[in-house]
């Protein structure tokens, strides 16, 4: 039975040119964490395996940086970066569990973090 | 330029082990990360596992968990497989290969279990 | 494990024509799939990665595209050299697993 849940940093903004950490939490669970991938719409941005380390892919590999910790560094924010933002936590025995980050990236100098949220 | 260089092909007996090896060079051998692959009947790919210099992290398919072993040795930029309890099932070509998608490949090393 | 299905073995081809060959996962795995062709008596050579990148010195002929669990691999205008055996891989998770292989032959 899967008990986990995943915190985030829920519905974030920033500015463009600017840069934001994508960050999620796994709680209420005792399941090895063995992998974390990160995913935007249709395309992998970056995993970071337990074992093997931090994989970036190529599309984002000169404005990604990872960590900390688990999380994700998106730097030189473009408007295009605008959209969901996936964390897709592997664990043993659990399984996957999976956190949603909506990034709006704004042209002014108004954009504020929202509030966190958790996904069961 | 980017080699791999894998040792040479052996016959072994059922029931032995094998130690193969991996000499690399022309690339930085802690900024990637490096895999055995085995082939079988000149078809079939398999990851057995794979390794990453930089932290000593080893990553194994379960299948081969008993099986394989894998090591490194830093001075000399070189991996090493054993496979132990070795059978007719373990007869293959078993290639390293380096990064996450296999950029580099070594030759291959033949590997025929026979009594 | 992440079963990755070439459903074609063999496909037969003339020298000139677009070929594209279909991988399916059994399980998303994004666009974290990489192509290979080997060569007779060759090892595996990296052409595709991240699903739709050129490895270095791989000729544009070779393109890749797809996410999720539809992944294709096209040679838009095949050669002689081409002739070989090819694999798709994901890297989506562990343990990293390979098609069967498509064998591109002249009809």
């Known amino acids: 039975m899967m008990t986990g849940t995943i915190e985030t940093t829920g519905n974030i903004s920033a500015e463009k040119g600017g840069s934001i950490i994508l960050q999620c939490h796994l709680s209420s669970t005792t399941a090895q964490v063995t992998q974390v991938n990160w995913e935007q719409q249709d395309q992998l941005l970056a995993i970071c395996n337990a074992d093997l380390g931090w994989h970036i892919s190529p599309s984002f590999k000169d404005r990604v940086a990872p960590g900390p910790g688990l999380g994700l560094t998106l730097q030189s924010l473009t408007v295009n970066d605008t959209g969901e933002y996936f964390c897709i936590y592997h664990t043993y025995p659990d399984g996957t569990y999976t956190g949603r980050i909506f990034l709006e990236v704004l042209e002014s100098s108004v954009a504020e973090h929202g509030a966190r949220f958790q996904i069961p | 330029e980017v080699q791999l260089q894998q040792s040479g092909p052996e016959l072994v007996k059922p029931g032995a082990s094998v130690k193969i090896s991996c000499k690399t060079s022309?690339?930085?051998?802690?900024?990637?990360?490096l895999h055995w692959v085995k082939q079988s009947h000149g078809k079939n790919l398999e990851w057995i596992g794979g390794f990453n210099p930089n932290n000593g992290g080893t990553n194994y398919n379960q299948k081969f968990k008993v099986k394989a072993s894998l090591t490194i040795d830093k001075s000399s930029n070189t991996v090493y497989m054993e496979l132990r309890s070795l059978s007719s099932e373990d007869s293959a070509v078993y290639y390293c290969?380096?990064?996450?998608?296999?950029?580099?490949w070594g030759q291959g090393t033949t590997l025929t279990v026979s009594s | 494990d992440i079963v990755m299905t070439q459903s074609h073995k063999i496909m037969s081809t003339s020298l000139g024509d677009r070929v594209n060959i279909t991988c399916k996962a059994s399980?998303?795995?994004?666009?974290?799939v990489a192509w290979y062709q080997q060569r007779p008596g060759q090892s595996p050579r990296l052409l595709i990665y991240?699903?739709?990148y050129r490895h270095t010195g791989v000729p544009d002929r070779f393109t890749g595209s797809g996410s999720g669990t539809d992944i294709t691999f096209t040679i838009s205008s095949v050669q002689t050299e081409d002739l070989a055996v090819y694999y798709c891989?994901?890297?989506?998770?562990?343990?990293?697993?390979f098609g069967g292989g498509t064998k591109l032959e002249i009809k």
């Open positions: 022309g690339y930085t051998f802690s900024d990637y990360t």
């Open positions: 991240s699903a739709s």
């Open positions: 290969a380096r990064n996450w998608a296999f950029d580099y």
């Open positions: 399980q998303h795995v994004s666009t974290a």
């Open positions: 891989q994901q890297y989506y998770t562990t343990p990293w697993t």
